[in-house]
Amino acid sequence: FPMFKRGRCLCIGPGVKAVKVADIEKASIMYPSNNCDKIEVIITLKENKGQRCLNPKSKQARLIIKKVERKNF
């Protein structure tokens, strides 16, 4: 995130409810910190289509968070 500035969240707005699984290249989870007080789920899309924030309250986001947490712990 080249433009990332301290003290602010990476996403603006509530985020998309779902992204087609076939379009997902990578999912990153940013946990609450001094920079942002909420969890953010950032999806990198395939074919150089950029990034999108997933609504952390959505079913898909909850599944991704669970999957990542299982993998990491």
Epitope: F1, P2, M3, F4, R8, C9, L10, C11, I12, G13, P14, G15, V16, K17, V19, I42, I43, L45, N48, K49, G50, Q51, R52, C53, L54, N55
Partner: nanobody
């Protein structure tokens, strides 16, 4: 049917002001961030300013900070961009967009995605020196 209608563009002298309006309809305002983007001839479309109607969070490109102010009237489903101290380099077509999942860091070279973004037709802003 989703509609975003921009108004308020025009020709202004350097140092002058304009106020752009974007009237939105056909979708739930609170589910989207609403932003102003601009495209100058031969340049990429870039994010200028964005507001999240659900929580009031805002974003401004470095080039407009302190000069432009974004605001929204949720009762009217309308977003405004007050542009002061305009410079010739602000000359561009200004588009209003409603989008989901915008990542602030990608706003300087924005890639539109028709699944998540709605766009207006654009309004020309010309700043003469």
């Amino acid at each position: 049917e989703v509609q975003l209608v921009e108004s308020g563009g025009g020709l202004v002298q350097a140092g002058g002001s304009l106020r752009l309006s974007c009237a939105a309809s056909g979708f739930n305002f609170d589910d989207y961030a609403i932003g102003w983007f601009r495209q100058a001839p031969g340049k990429e479309r870039e994010g200028v300013s964005i507001i999240s109607s659900s929580d009031g969070n805002t974003y401004y490109a470095d080039s407009v900070k302190g000069r432009f102010t974004i605001s929204s009237d949720n009762a009217k489903n309308t977003v405004y961009l007050q542009m002061n101290s305009l410079k010739p380099e602000d000359t561009a077509v200004y588009y209003c967009a409603a989008g989901q999942g915008w990542v602030i860091a990608t706003m300087t070279s924005f890639r539109a995605h028709r699944e998540y973004d709605y766009w207006g037709q654009g309004t020309q802003v010309t700043v003469s020196s």
